[in-house]
């Protein structure tokens, strides 16, 4: 799976979209999880309604919401009041049994609020994040991770 980068501004909302084949994943609940380390587990943040037919209903866990357009085949995650600690690698997942298929790998980048004059030193960006050749604007800026980019900050 390629990684898609979604960028949002600190303090604002970020919408992440994950398209999928609606027939291939028919009847399956979806989830949004956060990758813990490069080879670590993906920790569940929020999942769609327990009843698949009600997947269109928005479910919240803290400041993160999930909703699923099961006919159109688009899973949408909203990160409200984006904070620097929200930056990192995530996955959209399709659940079957107790297993999960990855629909999309997502790198969330948090940009400093240009109107906020406080020190932005605690905002983390993976290397080369200034490169926007492939960016396209949806509800957020998103692009595919470029070759050589690291989805995790280097560990010392």
């Amino acid at each position: 799976h390629n990684t898609t980068v979604f960028q949002g501004v600190a303090g604002q909302s970020l919408q992440v979209s994950c398209p999928y084949d609606s027939m291939k994943h028919w009847g399956r609940r979806k989830a949004w999880c956060r990758q813990l380390g490069e080879k670590g587990p993906c920790q569940r943040v929020v999942s769609t309604h327990n009843l698949w037919l009600l997947s269109f209903l928005r479910r919240w866990n803290g400041s993160t919401a999930i909703t699923d357009d099961t006919l159109g085949g688009t899973l949408t995650i909203t990160l409200r009041n984006l904070q620097p600690h929200d930056a990192g690698l995530y996955q959209c997942q399709s659940l079957h049994g107790s297993e999960a298929d990855t629909l999309r790998k997502v790198l969330v980048e948090v940009l400093a609020d240009p109107l906020d004059h406080r020190d932005a030193g605690d905002l983390w960006f993976p290397g080369e994040s200034e490169s926007f050749e492939d960016a396209h604007v949806e509800h957020s800026i998103s692009r595919s991770l470029l070759e050589g980019e690291i989805p995790f900050p280097p560990t010392s």
Epitope: M23, K24, G27, R28, W52, L53, L95, G97, S98
Partner: antibody, heavy 123, light 107 residues
Framework: EVQLVQSGAEVKKPGESLKISCKGS????????IAWVRQMPGKGLEWMGI????????RYSPSFQGQVTISADKSISTAYLQWSSLKASDTAMYFC????????????????WGQGTLVTVSS | DIQMTQSPSSVSASVGDRVTITCRAS??????LAWYQQKPGKAPKLLIY???SLQLGVPSRFSGSGSGTDFTLTISSLQPEDFATYFC?????????FGQGTKLEIK
């Protein structure tokens, strides 16, 4: 009417190759996963693997990974199971089965089965 | 892999009897379990899915229960056409393993 029709019985020698088929009708073939299941003579059922004909996404059981190849051609609504070099121990009945996901369950079950293809490998 | 163990491996019963077959998973599988019936020379037939949901067209004398690791298939009043082999299968993880089967014979 949903139907899965499998190819006929085969008698082969060890080392030979073989490809058996499973043709679906009465439903949108490309939109349902297809599983392959082995049943050796007088024995139980063994799950071999599964394929989504829509994009040929395949999952194998570790026991069968590298031993067989599962493929599909959605344009002719057919799934395949093939061997490059048969062994006597491959002698068995092979079933294909359509996988159905039930909207309140989020897992899949084999709701329609083919009639089976008997493969006999003997020198 | 998840191991599925059925008991008994065979059972003799008469028409009209109530029969219970059990299936135990080597680890918790929630309610992701199916029961199949197979007659000699035929393909298996789905009876129960999601541990307790009756497949369309299957007689109501068949019922399933259980969750986690222990499951049962019950036939409330045996009919002549019910004499067959029954398999459980977990739908929790790949590979989707089956129990070894329970042969239901006429007493």
């Amino acid at each position: 009417e949903v139907q899965l029709v499998q190819s006929g019985a085969e008698v082969k020698k060890p080392g030979e190759s073989l490809k058996i088929s499973c043709k679906g009708s009465g439903y949108s073939f490309g939109s349902y996963w297809i599983a392959w299941v082995r049943q050796m003579p007088g024995k139980g059922l063994e799950w071999m693997g599964i394929i989504y004909p829509g994009d040929s996404d395949v999952r194998y059981s570790p026991s069968f990974q590298g031993q067989v190849t599962i493929s599909a051609d959605k344009s002719i609504s057919t799934a395949y199971l093939q061997w490059s070099s048969l062994k006597a121990s491959d002698t068995a009945m092979y079933f294909c089965a359509r996988q159905r996901t039930f909207y309140y369950d989020s897992s899949d079950y084999s709701d329609y089965w083919g009639q089976g293809t008997l493969v006999t490998v003997s020198s | 892999d998840i191991q599925m163990t059925q008991s008994p491996s065979s059972v003799s019963a008469s028409v009209g009897d109530r029969v219970t077959i059990t299936c135990r998973a080597s680890q918790g599988i929630s309610s992701w379990l199916a029961w199949y019936q197979q007659k000699p020379g035929k393909a298996p037939k789905l009876l129960i899915y999601a541990a307790s949901s009756l497949q369309l067209g299957v007689p109501s004398r068949f019922s399933g229960s259980g969750s986690g690791t222990d499951f049962t298939l019950t036939i409330s009043s045996l009919q002549p056409e019910d004499f067959a082999t029954y398999f459980c299968q977990q739908a929790d993880r790949f590979p989707r393993t089956f129990g070894q089967g329970t042969k239901l014979e006429i007493k």
